[in-house]
């Protein structure tokens, strides 16, 4: 059986949309599947790598690598999207390409970044972890760390940094899929909203879905002990 909830929820484009949340009901009347997984149920994606989920994550990453920051021209906010999802008339799509990207580092002026820009994250304005020396962030945004400390500046002069961010990674469903969404939409979908991150590649949704002890390597499920828990 399914339980359907419909509600007007604030979406990425800054408008309220009617959204359906479909919850698979427990046949025996009890905890939901998400709760059961958290309690230690035998859920194979938490025990070993699941090919289907792995393919989903890789597909999400490939899309994210090509994303940019969609900044609304009316200064209402910005969100990380694909070019096709960013209005050509109402917004500006900030994407480094060809020769427009910043240099990888002040020590290497010739090599330009082509992956990015990312809403509210830039190697030139992140103090911790700083992109310098032996720790220059790679030219692949899906390999960027979470910036834990931004440079103290009210305005950076960068369009993708000075906007109000409207969406962050949200882990939705037992499959551990990730979407950049508003907090409101994420909460309605019973997802896990990552306030600290800017990209889906920075969060490990399956680790959140599984709960219990975190995976030793966030990319590799290792909860073999579930076989004895349930």
């Amino acid at each position: 059986a399914q339980h359907v909830t419909t509600q007007l929820v604030l979406r990425n484009k800054g408008v309220y949309e009617s959204v359906k949340y479909i919850q698979q009901e427990n046949f025996w009347i009890g905890p939901s599947s998400i709760d059961l997984i958290h309690l230690g149920a035998k859920f194979s994606p938490c025990i070993r790598k699941d090919q289907q989920i792995e393919q989903l994550v890789l597909r999400e990453r490939d899309l994210e690598r090509d994303s940019g920051c969609c900044v609304q021209n009316d200064h209402s906010g910005c969100i990380q999207t694909q070019r096709k999802d960013c209005s050509e008339t109402l917004a500006t799509f900030v994407k480094w390409q060809d020769d427009t990207g910043p240099p990888m580092d002040k020590s290497d002026l010739g090599q330009k970044r082509t992956s990015g820009a990312v809403c509210h994250q830039d190697p030139r304005t992140c103090e911790e972890p700083a992109s310098s020396g032996a720790h220059i962030w790679p030219d692949d945004i899906t390999k960027w760390p979470i910036c834990t400390e931004q440079a103290k500046s009210n305005r950076t002069g960068f369009l993708h940094m000075d906007c109000q961010i409207k969406g962050r990674p949200c882990c939705i469903s037992t499959k551990g899929s990730c979407e950049i969404t508003t907090r409101e939409y994420c909460e309605f979908m019973h997802g896990y909203f990552h306030e600290e991150a800017t990209l889906c590649s920075q969060v490990h949704c399956l680790d959140k879905v599984c709960g219990l002890l975190p995976f030793l390597n966030p990319e590799v499920p290792d909860q073999f002990y579930r076989l004895w828990l349930s």
Epitope: S107, L109, K112, R124, T125, A130, A151, R155, F158
Partner: antibody, heavy 123, light 106 residues
């Protein structure tokens, strides 16, 4: 308000070491992304970049003059220093220090310049 | 090193006249920066990232170009624009400036 002021000996003899100081206010070189550069200009001629120093103590020099240049900073005193060893009459010029804009540009640029100090190398 | 060649070396213009000067790079650069220097004064930045106007710079100034060819335009010359203009690149070390274009008032 950001200001920079250069100071130096004014006149010195060939083979001596030129020591210049750039004293600044309105910003700190301990601030992430900040930098200061030195540029010189012989009288009636164009601008020549010499060196940059950054908040993280990274230093970059003009390769043509690198063996003679040394840049350093005293963050607590808001000062940057430049030494040019073994000077020659060709080093006679007005020396400018300039702040490097930390943000806003895809690269960087010299957004605020000092008034310059004139140095004459003469025997 | 990247050599920047500015032309013309000297030019004159009447008030209200449109002025265009160019900067040619010996190899491709990503962006160009333009500075204005008046006699007895230090340089000040006019344009950064090829076409962005620095704060406080009149809108009659504009920059354009890409690759090896860049230009600075003054839409309507004013007396206070008489100065020497330098282009500068930050695409590779050593950082280099052009030799300058001296703009005189006719």
């Amino acid at each position: 308000q950001v200001t920079l002021k250069e100071s130096g000996p004014g006149i010195l003899q060939p083979s001596q070491t030129l020591s210049l100081t750039c004293s600044f206010s309105g910003f700190s070189l301990s601030t992430f992304g900040m930098g200061v550069g030195w540029i010189r200009q012989p009288s009636g001629k164009g601008l020549e970049w010499l060196t940059n120093i950054w908040w993280d103590d990274d230093k970059y020099y003009n390769s043509v003059l690198k063996s003679r240049l040394t840049i350093s900073k005293d963050t607590s005193k808001n000062q940057v220093f430049l030494k040019i060893a073994n000077v020659d009459t060709a080093d006679t010029a007005t020396y400018y220090c300039a702040r490097i804009a930390a943000y806003g540009s895809n690269y960087w640029y010299f957004d605020v310049w000092g008034t310059g100090t004139t140095v004459t190398v003469s025997s | 090193q990247i050599v920047l060649t500015q032309s013309p070396a000297i030019m004159s213009a009447s008030p209200g006249e449109k002025v265009t000067m160019t900067c040619s790079a010996s190899s491709s650069v990503s962006y160009m920066y333009w500075y204005q220097q008046k006699p007895g004064s230090s340089p000040r930045v006019l344009i950064y990232d090829t076409s962005n106007l620095s704060s406080g710079v009149p809108v009659r100034f504009s920059g354009s170009g890409s690759g090896t060819s860049y230009s600075l335009t003054i839409s309507r010359m004013e007396a206070e624009d008489a100065a020497t203009y330098y282009c500068q690149q930050w695409s590779s070390y050593p950082l280099t400036f052009g030799a300058g274009t001296k703009l005189e008032l006719k």
